[in-house]
């Protein structure tokens, strides 16, 4: 059997050591003890007696099935306790009585059915994070379960086999910053929602089949809900249940952000929100995020004209990796307040983009992200986007473009352009001179000779440049990142010729550790101020005797350098 390894500050690591019991020899000097991934099974009343100053105890996945009632009685300083993924089929309030300093408690993934016969947490007045429940057996939430808890930063409840929710069980917690609920179905959703309306600021619903969700008015008085964010992850919706969910928004008037992540819509987008009287109640929602939305019949999807009016005040929309191939012109025109639009990892091509960015489309748009779509012509893309009079930032990275032409047209206010990972080999005057930030990293560039008088930031890492670009090309450059190229050297003159340069990242290049380069680095201790990744990323590639040495440590041979 292996032993613990402890550092000078009292942090002890005993993970995956094949312990079959709590190891002996624990002391009051220990501040943190991690015994995860062992086969401990049992914690006796004296096993942790010596650890009076322990602040962190991690016992995750250690096959624990029995803990004596007073096993933790000496742990008054404990702030973090992780008992997740063990074999505890019942929980005891006597474990937690002495733990008055506890801030974090994870009991998730143990096979209990309830949280115990009596309230577990009345003494945990400092608790900030609580994780409870499991996938298969946790079936009941009762009013006594959260007694004594008044405020939590994070509460996560995995209740995927919930059979009974006692009304008002969650109401006793007056303030919850982030509540994550894993519910397999919507049976108790309305009851829970009513109980958390006045306490939760961010509600995250996971793995819930909402296909049969039906709204009914909540039994609540006029309530001013603090909820600002609502997220659905791994959930299933239908057109009908989406309409029903919208009706909940009348109770959360301060909601500013809605997110759907990895959800499935078994429908066609035939929404009818007008009858749910929510148009005005969406007034404060500014951010809508949709990622990996799976629509089995996406090829039959509607034009969403029924939700146009819902989204008129939204400022930020992300629809990522969801097979989007068109935003209809009329929809774009209705998105009057939209300032940020991210359509990454979709199926957009120039022909349909032209329809999406029609005259009057997205009139307030400042940032457009079209990364990893199916765009091919930089010239066409720029031309299509001329309708966007307020566009300042464009990300068309991870599209495979044809070679760029000599001239292109772009929206006149454009200041930021991301062309990273687009396979470009040469930069030409197609790139607008108005740019302040240009990202051309991860391409096939072996040179860069384009004059950009306003450029402040240049990202050109992961290319094939052999030297730093000429400073005269960028008279106001502040930041250059040129890591992972083939740069072999840089000199005092080169760096000095960038009059305003504040940050240079040039690590992981093929440095030839010549007398000149090494002399320069030795004589210039201020390099660390400008080279943000200095010294660890700056290694000699040659000569052979210095290969792999840091430039900072490499010493030129007196013989070589004074010939």
């Amino acid at each position: 059997q292996e032993s613990l390894s402890c550092d000078a500050s009292g942090v002890c690591d005993g993970r995956s050591r094949s312990f079959t019991s709590i190891p002996s020899g624990l002391t009051a000097a220990m501040k943190s003890l991690d015994l995860s991934f062992n086969k401990i099974t049992y914690i006796g009343h004296g096993d942790l007696r010596a650890c009076a100053n322990l602040q962190v105890l991690i016992l995750k996945s250690s096959r624990i099935n029995t803990i004596e009632g007073d096993a933790f009685y000496s742990l008054g300083s404990l702030e973090h306790l992780d008992l997740s993924d063990n074999h505890l089929s019942s929980l005891s309030s006597s474990w937690f009585g002495p733990l008055s300093s506890l801030k974090y408690l994870n009991l998730m993934g143990n096979p209990y059915q309830t949280l115990g016969v009596t309230s577990l947490f009345p003494n945990l007045t400092n608790l900030q994070t609580l994780r409870i429940g499991n996938v298969e057996t946790f079936s009941e939430i009762r009013r006594i379960d959260f007694a004594g808890l008044t405020s939590l930063n994070e509460l996560e409840i995995k209740a995927l086999s919930l059979r009974n929710y006692q009304s008002q069980s969650l109401k006793s917690i007056r303030d919850i910053h982030h509540l994550t609920l894993h519910l397999s179905e919507s049976a108790f959703l309305l009851e829970i929602f009513a109980d958390i309306l006045s306490s939760v600021r961010y509600l995250e619903l996971r793995d819930t089949n909402l296909a049969r969700f039906q709204f009914s008015p909540l039994p609540v008085d006029e309530v001013s809900s603090p909820m600002k964010k609502l997220a659905f992850r791994g959930s299933v919706l239908t057109d009908e249940s989406f309409n029903e969910l919208l009706k909940l928004l009348r109770y959360i008037l301060e909601l500013s952000e809605v997110e759907f992540d990895d959800c499935t819509l078994n429908g066609l987008g035939d929404f009818n929100p007008s009858e749910s009287d929510v148009v005005s109640e969406l007034g404060k929602v500014e951010t809508v995020t949709i990622r990996r939305l799976h629509i089995p019949q996406f090829y039959l999807f509607y034009d969403l004209s029924t939700v146009y009016s819902l989204l008129e005040k939204v400022k930020r929309i992300t629809v990522e990796n969801s097979k989007v191939f068109l935003v209809p012109c009329s929809f774009s025109q209705h998105l009057k307040s939209l300032e940020f639009l991210d359509l990454s990892e979709n199926l957009m091509v120039e022909e349909y983009l032209k329809n999406s960015a029609c005259k009057g489309a997205w009139p307030s748009l400042q940032t457009l992200v079209l990364s990893q779509n199916h765009l091919r012509s930089m010239q066409k893309t720029g031309e299509i986007l001329l309708t966007l009079k307020n566009l300042t930032s464009l990300d068309i990275s991870r599209n495979t473009f044809h070679p760029m032409p000599d001239s292109c047209q772009w929206p006149e206010k454009m200041r930021f352009l991301n062309l990273s990972s687009t396979g470009i080999r040469v930069v030409k005057t197609c790139i607008p001179q108005t740019l302040e930030v240009l990202d051309v990293s991860n391409n096939n560039l072996d040179s860069f000779s384009l004059f950009l008088p306003r450029l402040q930031e240049l990202y050109i890492s992961r290319n094939k440049l052999k030297t730093l670009p000429d400073a005269s090309l960028f008279p106001v450059l502040l930041v250059m990142k040129i890591r992972e190229n083939a740069v072999s050297t840089f000199s005092k003159d080169q760096l000095g010729s960038f009059p305003k340069l504040e940050t240079l990242e040039a690590g992981d290049n093929h440095f030839v550790c010549s007398c000149e380069l090494l002399s320069f680095t030795m004589e210039t201790p201020a390099l660390a101020q400008i080279l943000v990744d200095w010294p660890d990323s700056y290694l000699c590639d040659s000569p052979p005797r210095l290969h792999g040495h840091r430039l900072q440590d490499a010493r030129p041979s007196v013989l070589e350098c004074h010939q």
Epitope: T208, G234, D262, H294
Partner: nanobody, 122 residues
Framework: EVQLVESGGGLVQAGGSLRLSCAAS????????MGWFRQAPGKEREFVAV????????DYSTYVKGRFTIFRDNAKNTVFLEMTSLEPEDTAVYYC???????????????WGQGTPVTVSS
């Protein structure tokens, strides 16, 4: 109506590995949550692992977490259970199940396979 057929069970030594497969018939496979359960002789059926419609969420019984991996291939209408570091206590008949709800509660699954036996010898 989805039909499920498990395969891949057999005899293996403690510490060894097995991969179970469950092939589903029908065109709506990707709409189902898929679960694996097991039943040892003389014991009740118990939850092993579950995967959601897209494969984006997975969960495991504490008894197998870290050793078993569930994954699915919707294009091939198949769900898999990769079992490593097998122990004699893992000996059981393993069943694949399909349902509408992401849960470890076996009563919520509507469709079941006939099972494939796994024996782990010490």
């Amino acid at each position: 109506e989805v039909q499920l057929v498990e395969s891949g069970g057999g005899l293996v030594q403690a510490g060894g590995s097995l991969r179970l497969s469950c092939a589903a018939s029908g065109r709506t496979f990707s709409r189902y949550v898929m679960g694996w359960f097991r039943q040892a002789p003389g014991k009740e059926r118990e939850f092993v692992a579950v995967i959601n419609w897209s494969g984006g969420s997975t969960d495991y019984s504490t008894y197998v977490k870290g050793r078993f991996t569930i994954f699915r291939d919707n294009a091939k209408n198949t769900v898999f259970l990769e079992m490593t570091s097998l122990e004699p206590e893992d000996t059981a008949v393993y069943y694949c199940a399909a349902g509408e709800y992401y849960t470890g509660d076996s009563s919520r699954y509507d469709h079941w396979g006939q099972g494939t036996p796994v024996t782990v010898s010490s």
